[in-house]
């Protein structure tokens, strides 16, 4: 049930406290006017209130803070710095605002912040030090364990340098924020779904050795050739559904097979069932790591459309002979 709006949630009212014979009441924790607070649940919800900035008077007991569906466009450095500090804040949800810019050190002075959700914000300027907090080459480790960055890609007309170059720049910006200062070594969950990513910057995963869950679903990844999963020995789930993957090659297959706890999700990719698919088909028939592997179907070539990958054999997987240059047309 929703806590009452803007009501301090001390379990005993001052009047009742005095009536009980005690000399003075405990200090009633403030609740910002646009929020709902529950001290018992250590939760503050400031949701869909058109807030332009983070409320100043957040109660220091807050463990879970929801600031979703507001109108914030910039998250400045020290946006959550308070006196006394919000030392117990563990989960911060900023999804569905209009955040365009997250500045360096925006989440400083939150020593217990484990879970951060910035999804559904059109981030045109995500500082490289948004999560690291300082611009040292090696920052103090961030306490973050879960970082949710689904659908943070700005609309095409807000990206720099047009569509393709803008996407490369956007991916680089996100990668820089994940890599800066090696601060996210303890990150266990990273969600990057629905961001139109064309590729995964190759250094990112190597710097996130603690990852258990990686969600790259609903992007535009065409290939994993230059991505290494080898160091992610703790990885338990890898979501690659709804991308543009055509085939997984031997190196990727071997790396995935070598991860001891992994479950891989590959549904809704436009698999190309030609001679290059043979290794993947052999692997699929043997592996247990792919969830719902019986649902993977060919998208191309046309004659193979809808065929189930598990049911293919080498005779089915041919490549049209390459014409000599003299017979090729443009």
């Amino acid at each position: 049930s929703a806590p009452s709006s803007s009501v301090p949630s001390s379990s005993t009212s001052p009047a009742a406290f005095l009536a009980s014979g005690s000399a003075q009441p405990p200090p009633a924790e403030r609740c910002p006017a646009a929020c709902e607070c529950s001290e018992a649940a250590r939760t503050v919800k400031c949701v869909n209130r058109n807030l332009l900035e983070v409320p100043a008077d957040l109660p220091p007991y807050v463990r879970n803070l929801f600031l979703t569906g507001n109108q914030m466009t910039v998250l400045p450095a020290g946006a959550f710095a308070r006196q006394p500090p919000l030392a117990d804040l563990e989960a911060l949800n900023l999804s569905g605002n209009h955040l365009k810019e997250v500045c360096a050190g925006a989440f400083e002075h939150l020593p217990g912040l484990r879970r951060l959700d910035l999804s559904h914000n059109p981030l045109t300027n995500l500082s490289a030090f948004a999560f690291a907090g300082s611009n040292a080459s090696v920052s103090a480790p961030s306490p973050l364990e879960e970082l949710i960055l689904n659908h943070i890609v700005p609309p095409e007309d807000q990206r720099q340098n047009g569509s393709f170059e803008g996407m490369v720049a956007f991916e680089g910006m996100v990668a820089a924020a994940l890599l800066a200062g090696r601060a996210l070594q303890g990150l266990r969950r990273l969600e990057l779904a629905s961001n139109h990513f064309l590729y995964l910057p190759r250094d990112v995963l190597a710097q996130l050795p603690s990852l258990r869950h990686l969600d790259l679903s609903n992007n535009s990844l065409v290939s994993l050739t230059y991505v290494s999963f080898r160091n992610l020995t703790h990885l338990e789930s890898l979501h690659l559904e709804d991308n543009a993957l055509k085939v997984l090659h031997n190196g990727t297959l071997a790396e995935l097979q070598g991860l001891p706890h992994i479950r891989v999700f590959l549904d809704n990719n436009p698999w190309v069932c030609d001679c290059h698919m043979a290794d993947m088909v052999t692997w699929l028939k043997e592996t247990e790591v792919v969830q719902g592997k019986d649902r993977l179907t060919c998208a191309y070539p046309e004659k193979m459309r809808n065929r189930v990958l598990l049911e293919l054999n080498s005779a089915d997987l041919d490549c049209d002979p390459i014409l000599p240059p003299s017979l090729q047309t443009s």
Partner: antibody
Amino acid sequence: QGQLQQSGAELMKPGASVKISCRGTGYTFRSYWIEWVKQRPGHGLEWIGEILPGIGSTYYNEKFKGKATFTADTSSNTAYMQLSSLTSDDSAVYFCARGGRDFDYWGQGTTLTVSS
Amino acid sequence: DIQMTQTTSSLSASLGDRVTISCRASQDINNYLNWYQQKPDGTVKLLIYDTSRLHSGVPSRFSGSGSGTDFSLTISNLEPEDIATYYCQQYSKLPYTFGSGTKLEIK
């Protein structure tokens, strides 16, 4: 070019069970999903579920779990749907289709009438 | 479940007309949308898959477009044999779901 041929119309009593068949020809039957779709008179199309004949994997729409059961026989290239504990709500035309990312070939439909 | 909505249940047009039938998904389904034609005799055929790709044997007067949640099927030059009911269907997530259909009639 694939083709699907379904069994003929059925008139059944309430509480009974019925088994509808769907035979695939002109393609590698075991390698494609067979979808089952319901259409009640004057209504649209409703997906019941699917079976992959080569493996026997099945997925059901929650709404039809316990009502429909899919099986397949790759030796005769035939998929079956059994409907149990029939009621008047089960009176409909049932289609099979070759599936995957889309349902590219459809059977002609089997009309089931449930009446006492 | 993903709901597919075809707001126009029936549509009347003249031969030679350009006809557009719309379909809306209750959530983003990328381009995972197909269109089917059901003739008055009950036979069902795939027309368009992956939002805009024409199934083999389907006349080029049929075309599809859209992405995300809003999709449309266009018949550029209506012929007598196009009299049918048209259904959209999503395959983004199980269970697959169909729109309620748009019945196309000749004026």
